[in-house]
Interface confidence: low
């Protein structure tokens, strides 16, 4: 059945209640320099109205503080209102390493990010940090790497490993959850000149992730004890017509081309899904496409296999698909898939359909295919035009969390966290935020607060309290770490 009645029950005490933000652009200078200037000034208020330094006088300054960054203050105010336990945000690779290598490290950018994490920990909010968050409009690579063919160049993977190592070194004592790359399976939108470009870029992204994971595993895990994965865009697919055999095939093919493409090599075999490889090969044989998936060497398969500590999925909607044979040598045509918009479904302004049961089906599919592992939903949300009473978002959150709870309680999926997307919206972009672009709160915040404080949808008489030790363990550890490192 598509949807089943709502359940009453709670998520576990160690469940991560998160909110996701995309790339945080670091502030280059703290916005309150007056506290770090030791000089005394006289203000010529009636004359030229300038400040004149008084020579020979030095004042006591206070050390620079993280809250000197205005942006961080804003972040903290919003996070405090969200009542979340976790904050997922992304670093800007191009800001941290403008040259693309370790020859010029932007220490100020790293200090800014460290401040975001440490100030969050003081509020009891842990960070999940994404190292690389490309978007359709902005690839987010350091300029030199971009000009050297970006992800079509295998050396970009090695550059990424060096960057990841720097971040683990600088932030890893405070950060216990890492995402190497956000939605590498969506870079097909950018590397789309040909299927072979798409598959070549994807291959280098997989290698980049694996190199970073292996570096963490070998060098940083023993002392830092964190976990590393990558986030895959993971919308569910249903056949447009459930009685058309070809539509079922198309739905499964969508999942193979969208999710298994990256999941299979990392979680399972070290190689691309056989179904995907064979489908592309059969189109090639029939002269419908000149695409081919890269052949992996034994060494590459060994490198990729098993390089995830948990499964991270970004899930927004369910797509209705049908088979349509398409000629052409691009990723989109290699799949032979046509999407149908079901106008009878509740949808958002950007036409995202609200289909809560899709997330439960996705979680079951992942477990069935890749085994019983920890799963985090690292981004999930909807755009809502309302600037105050965002009822669509409240409905979406309530219904999707219900289905996640069913997956946990009924299907016994090891779901460890849910990160709502996103903290604040950006000007002239679809309105996914809990806060407007000028930081005004929307009513969905209270709704999410209530779900978090109840740990789900409890029975009337059940307690939402967790034992003191469980609730405070992380923060005690975190505060200890914060005190140890300025």
């Amino acid at each position: 059945k598509e949807s089943t009645p709502d359940v009453q029950g709670q998520f576990p005490c160690d469940f991560s209640w998160g909110v996701t933000e995309s790339v945080l652009k670091p502030e280059s200078v703290a916005s309150s320099p007056q506290f770090s200037d030791p000089h005394l000034y006289v203000w010529n208020a009636t004359g030229n109205r300038l400040l004149h330094r008084v020579e020979g006088v030095r004042l006591k300054t206070r050390p620079a503080q993280c809250t000197d960054f205005v942006n961080i203050k804003k972040q903290l105010e919003m996070l405090a209102r969200m009542k979340v336990t976790h904050y997922r945000f992304a670093l800007d690779w191009a800001s941290v390493l403008p040259t693309g290598n370790l020859s010029a490290v932007n220490r100020q950018a790293l200090r800014y990010y460290r401040c975001v994490v440490s100030e969050g920990l003081k509020l009891g909010i842990s960070a999940m940090v994404t190292l690389y968050y490309p978007t359709h409009a902005h690839l987010g690579l350091p300029e030199p790497l971009l000009h050297a063919d970006g992800w079509l160049n295998p050396s970009t993977a090695e550059a990424f490993q060096a960057y990841a190592g720097l971040c683990f070194q600088e932030l890893g004592d405070l950060v216990k959850l890492w995402i190497t790359i956000n939605e590498p399976n969506r870079l097909s939108d950018i590397y789309n000149r040909s299927g072979n470009d798409t598959y070549g870029a994807a291959h280098n992204l997989l290698v980049a992730h694996a190199l970073a994971w292996r570096l963490y595993d070998r060098q940083f895990r023993p002392s830092q004890r964190g976990a590393v994965s990558l986030s895959l865009h993971a919308d569910w697919a249903e056949p447009a017509n459930p009685y058309a055999d070809s539509h079922w095939r198309a739905a499964e093919r969508f999942l193979q081309f969208e999710i298994a493409w990256f999941a299979e090599p990392l979680f399972k075999t070290g190689d691309y899904p056989a179904a995907m490889r064979e489908y592309i090969a059969s189109k090639h044989r029939r002269g419908l496409s000149s695409s081919a998936l890269p052949r992996l060497t034994e060494a590459e398969r060994r490198l990729l296999k098993g390089t995830v500590d948990f499964c991270a999925l970004n899930h927004f909607t369910t797509r209705f698909v049908m088979h349509e044979q398409l000629a052409g040598s691009r990723y989109d045509s290699d799949r032979d898939i046509q999407f149908l918009q079901d106008i009878t479904r509740l949808s958002s302004p950007t036409r995202l359909a609200v289909i809560p049961w899709g997330v439960r089906k996705l979680l079951r599919w992942v477990r069935r295919n890749y085994g019983d592992m920890d799963i985090y939903i690292t981004a999930s949300g909807i755009d809502d035009q309302a600037l105050e009473d965002d009822r669509l978002r409240k409905y979406y959150l309530g219904k999707y969390l219900q289905e996640v709870l069913k997956a946990y309680l009924i299907d016994k999926v090891r779901i460890k966290g849910y990160y709502a997307f996103k903290l604040a919206e950006e000007k002239s972009k679809p309105r996914f935020g809990f806060f407007t672009s000028d930081f005004k709160a929307k009513s969905s915040i209270q709704f999410y607060n209530k779900v978090i404080s109840s740990r789900g949808f409890p029975f009337e008489n059940s307690s939402s309290r967790c034992s003191q030790t469980q609730e405070n363990t992380e923060c005690t550890v975190c505060l200890f770490l914060v005190q140890k490192k300025p």
Epitope: N241, Y243, W248, R249, E252, A274
Partner: antibody, heavy 123, light 111 residues
């Protein structure tokens, strides 16, 4: 119990049309599709096509395009197949059959069959 | 279209013995690790009856003496031990691609 009851035998003249019916009972008609299969005297089975009662969409074996038209009446849980421009070659037993569908399965088989309707084309 | 060739066209088997029917497809009917082959039994004046689906899955209610095996292009239906009521024509059917096609049939006679 689940049944597909087909209409009685038909004797028709060459060039005419005939409409066969298949009435479903014992299950939710709109949740399964109905397939039609032809069996000429002493011959094997040939798949004609399917219709999905929920939205009336149909798919035909290219060999039967223009020869057969599949329709449904959900109010009476009945599927119909109309055969056009009949010739002696169309003399056969025509079966309707239900195809089950389980989540995640793309296996296509017929678990319940109608009793069959004999169509004889003769002048 | 995928052509299914059944052999033998007819066979006579003694009661209690094994009957083996073969079905060869003109191209593979496998997809993503599954075999899309079904088997039916038809007695005179009756509609076909499903025995086996997906090459080897026995339909509930069908006796365990019926079994199916094979993959790719070669499939087999076994009946052991054969009983009197098994006298019928057996058809294989592929469900891998449109149009769904049937084999020519194998007539089983009990000696």
């Amino acid at each position: 119990q689940v049944q597909l009851q087909q209409s009685g035998p038909e004797l028709v003249k060459p060039g005419a049309s005939v409409k066969l019916s298949c009435k479903a009972s014992g299950y939710t008609f709109t949740n399964y599709d109905i397939n039609w299969v032809r069996q000429r005297p002493g011959q094997g089975l040939e798949w004609i096509g399917w219709i999905y009662p929920r939205d009336g969409s149909a798919k035909y074996n290219a060999k039967f395009k223009g020869k057969a038209t599949l329709t449904v009446d959900t109010s009476s849980s009945t599927a119909y197949m109309e055969l056009h421009s009949l010739t002696s070659e169309d003399s056969a037993v025509y079966f309707c059959a239900r195809r089950p569908l389980y989540y995640g399965s793309t296996h296509w088989y017929f678990d319940v069959w109608g009793t069959g309707t004999t169509v004889t084309v003769s002048s | 279209d995928i052509v299914l060739t059944q052999s033998p066209a007819s066979l006579a088997v003694s009661l209690g013995q094994r009957a083996t029917i073969s079905c060869k497809a003109s191209q593979s009917v496998d997809y993503d690790g599954d075999s899309y082959m079904n088997w039916y039994q038809q007695k005179p004046g009756q509609p076909p009856k499903l025995l086996i689906y997906a090459a080897s899955n026995l339909k509930s209610g069908i006796p365990a003496r019926f079994s199916g095996s094979g993959s790719g292009t070669d499939f087999t239906l076994n009946i052991h031990p054969v009983e009197e009521e098994d006298a019928a024509t057996y058809y294989c059917q592929q469900s891998n691609e449109d149009p769904r096609t049937f084999g020519g049939g194998t007539r089983l006679e009990i000696k």
